[in-house]
């Protein structure tokens, strides 16, 4: 028996076709992805072939104006309408907090939303029941196929779940569901979910009875052949584990954006056993032509998008000098306004003993790409912060050691005075540098606000010692020049669309006066 | 092989009650959302009644909610229509057909033979 | 609820002709859509599903076409076993509709 996997992670608000970098779409004949070509993609395959599931691996949620204006309406809307037949949820399913994910997504969704491994208590539990599972079975043909979810446990650092979700180890979660499974004689299981593909293996490995593992939130692309766009193989498609009880698993995942609909072919024996699995992820270009009617849906919708781009998020009562002249040379006012927001995005109070999980943020003054003038009534709107943010990036968050952040600080000033983007605008750092010494030993002292205390104080940076930073996903990729930050990271993890975190920064704040204050001597 | 047949169909008085069955063959029945059409003399199809494949939902048209229920025995691979408050406009050929396999509205790709209903006095 | 209006209602044609049936939706209901062929005192009999897939036994002389409110059911060249009344029926939303029916007959 044969099965057909289509699946889709880590979309994240792309819902109209983008640019080959994921970024908005400018030249419509080199664009690719959005939900009207994919549904063309989907409906050619469900046309050819008997039995087809449609799966996402979750964070539909967070990364373009589609989100921040329709709130997860638009998720709801679409899939339902692409006619998806399973989602796992993700970190940023959490983002607007459980509410968030309720109302527009769980109340208004025609297919099962699926996660084992997130326990609801208190008075959540009996709110939410039934509207997420643990699994669902879903009958493909005369066959029937076990789906089960899993979401990062990391979940409470990186979004607003709340304190009534309690996000368990993901293997230890699963493999009950996977035995109840089984007593229900379901024997082709499906583990669908969230957490990265280092975890995508690790489940493959160590739960007895999943037959597939279909993962997001890495963003990792697998290809078999050679690759048709920029994005380079993590491995080959399907990526196989051996479980520890001796089966060949196939492990995939689609990269992010839509850009990609990931193709798996499985052939079961009659006892549910995988015979064999091959495919490859469709790059979903212009060659794939949009659905009309599904690109007519999105056009209605848009034109509420427009009209929010416009409406004022809040005030500035000084000059936000986002200029290349300022934060490419020194502390810039915008650079502090940017990492204070992208620090407020992330504040998580999970522990008794810090105040919060990360208190340093760091942003290449390149990446700030004009200023923001007071003087039209000091009003701020998304189309401004899209001129002062116009890559549509991320704000993510990683995981570094003290000696790879003062490599990061060296390389900031490394040719200091050309108006190059890798001078870094900071928060909860204090920095000197001495432009007197040769490059590579230009900083003197290195600051950064504690974590672990009650009053959040500046202690010198510990070379051994692992640090929480928030920044964008460009530095994260080593952009700029900063390879040590990719190459020594130890954890990354994909955050906030950039203008949002600063939208919602400043309407929550409603007037901002951000200063040069010493960060950066 | 796939097959589906209908019974329990009849004359009946208006106001009246009547059970049609559907009994299926050849198939997964339990996988299948199940339909109910109808067809009055010398005219089109109406759509009247579908249970999802799990029993978890059911959907009518107006014509025929509060009045109809739809109801399946997987045990059994059998399909039923309760039929309470009979109008003479509910005349018809009844055709049980098989839908999809998921929740979302579906075609009908097999067809049973159809049961006649009449509704008089 | 959707309404499906087909047209024509009926049409007169002869064995090789190329026949053509449109079905037009009140709403748009992307390529949820399905024709079936019914001839007298028999059942309905399914052609065609999403708009343009062929149900498995169907002749290739079937197509369909069409999507959003604007659909068609052609044949390529009419059979004498394709005399029979035709419908759509859209599967976008609940309540399921079907168009009144088009009757081929022979000319």
């Known amino acids: 028996w044969e099965l057909t996997i289509l699946h889709t992670n880590d979309v994240h608000s792309r819902l109209e076709q983008t640019s080959e970098d994921s970024s908005k779409c400018v030249n419509a004949s080199r664009c690719m992805g959005g939900v009207a070509r994919l549904f063309t993609k989907v409906q050619q395959i469900r046309r050819a072939e008997p039995n087809v599931l449609l799966l996402d691996a979750g964070d539909q949620y967070q990364g373009t104006i589609w989100f921040t204006v329709y709130k997860g309406a638009e998720v709801a809307h679409f899939m339902n309408a692409l006619r998806y037949d399973a989602m796992a949820l993700g970190n940023h399913e959490f983002d607007n907090g459980v509410e968030g994910l309720i109302e527009p997504l769980l109340k208004e969704a025609k297919f099962p939303i699926l996660s084992a491994n997130i326990k609801a208590k208190g008075p959540l539990a009996s709110q939410i029941s039934g509207l997420y599972l643990p699994y669902k079975v879903l009958p493909v043909g005369d066959e029937v196929v076990g789906i089960v979810g899993y979401t990062s446990k990391e979940t409470p650092f990186l979004s607003n779940p709340g304190t009534n979700l309690v996000f368990e180890d993901e293997i230890t979660a699963l493999q009950p569901e996977v035995d109840k499974l089984k007593t229900l004689n379901v024997n082709k299981i499906i583990a669908l979910g969230h957490s990265g593909f280092e975890m995508d293996k690790l489940i493959a490995q160590k739960v007895r009875g999943v037959d597939v593992v279909v993962g997001g939130h890495s963003n990792t692309f697998l290809y078999t052949g050679n690759p048709p766009s920029k994005e380079v193989p993590a491995g080959k498609y399907p990526f196989i584990v051996t479980s520890d009880d001796g089966r060949k698993v196939p492990v995939v995942q689609a990269y992010a954006f839509g850009k990609y609909l990931g193709y798996l072919k499985i052939e079961f024996d009659e006892r549910g056993n995988v015979i064999s699995s091959h495919g490859n992820p469709i790059l979903l270009n212009s060659s794939i032509p949009e659905d009309p009617s599904i690109k007519a849906d999105i056009n209605k919708w848009r034109i509420k998008l427009d009209n929010y781009s416009t409406q004022e998020l809040g005030k500035t009562i000084v000059y936000l000098d986002g200029s290349s002249q300022s934060c490419r040379f020194r502390e810039c006012n915008m650079g502090n306004l940017i990492c204070d927001a992208m620090i407020n995005n992330n504040l998580r109070h999970t522990d008794e003993m810090f105040w919060n999980h990360v208190s340093m943020c760091i942003l290449n003054g390149g990446g700030i790409r004009s200023p923001i003038d007071e003087r039209n009534n000091g009003t701020i709107t998304w189309e401004n912060l899209a001129a002062v943010l116009p890559f549509g990036g991320t704000f993510d968050l990683v995981q570094l050691k003290g000696s790879t952040l003062k490599k990061a600080f060296e390389h900031s000033v490394h040719r200091y005075g050309q108006s190059t983007g890798e001078f870094l605008q900071v928060g909860g750092i204090h920095v000197v540098y001495d432009l007197s010494r040769k490059p590579g030993d230009r900083v003197v002292k290195l600051d950064v606000l504690c974590t672990k205390c009650r009053v959040p104080s500046y202690d010198p940076l510990k070379m051994d010692e692992v640090y929480k930073v928030i920044l964008p996903n460009f530095l994260a990729n080593g952009g700029d020049g900063f390879q040590m930050i990719k190459d020594e990271l130890l954890r990354h993890d994909s955050g906030d669309q950039d203008i949002n975190v600063v939208s919602t920064y400043i309407s929550k704040m409603k007037v901002i006066y951000p200063a040069v204050e010493g960060r950066i001597k | 092989q796939v097959q589906l047949v209908e019974s329990g169909g009849g004359v009946v008085q208006p106001g009246r009650s009547l059970r049609l069955s559907c009994a299926s063959s050849g198939f997964t029945f339990s996988n299948y959302g199940m339909h109910w059409v109808r067809q009055a003399p010398g005219k089109g199809l109406e759509w009247v009644a579908v249970i999802l494949y799990d029993s978890s939902n059911k959907y009518y048209p107006d014509s025929v909610k509060g009045r109809f229920t739809i109801s399946r025995d997987n045990s059994k691979n059998t399909l039923y229509l309760q039929m309470n408050s009979l109008r003479a406009e509910d005349t018809a050929v009844y055709y049980c057909?098989?839908?999809?396999?998921?929740?979302?509205?579906?075609?009908?790709?097999?067809w049973g033979q159809g049961t006649m209903v009449t509704v008089s006095s | 609820d959707i309404q499906m209006t087909q047209s024509p209602s009926s049409l007169s044609a002869s064995v090789g002709d190329r026949v053509t049936i449109t079905c037009r939706a009140s709403?748009?209901?992307?390529?949820?859509l399905a024709w079936y062929q019914q001839k007298p005192e028999k059942a309905p009999k399914s052609l065609i599903y999403a708009a343009s897939s062929l149900q498995s036994g169907v002749p290739s002389r079937f197509s369909g076409s069409g999507s959003g409110t604007d659909f068609t059911l052609t044949i390529s060249s009419l059979q004498p076993e394709d005399f029979a009344t035709y419908y759509c029926?859209?599967?976008?939303?609940?309540?399921?509709?079907f168009g009144g029916g088009t009757k081929v007959e022979i000319k």
């Open positions: 709403q748009g209901i992307s390529s949820w």
């Open positions: 057909a098989r839908g999809g396999s998921s929740w979302y509205p579906d075609s009908f790709d097999i």
């Open positions: 029926q859209q599967y976008n939303s609940y309540p399921l509709t």
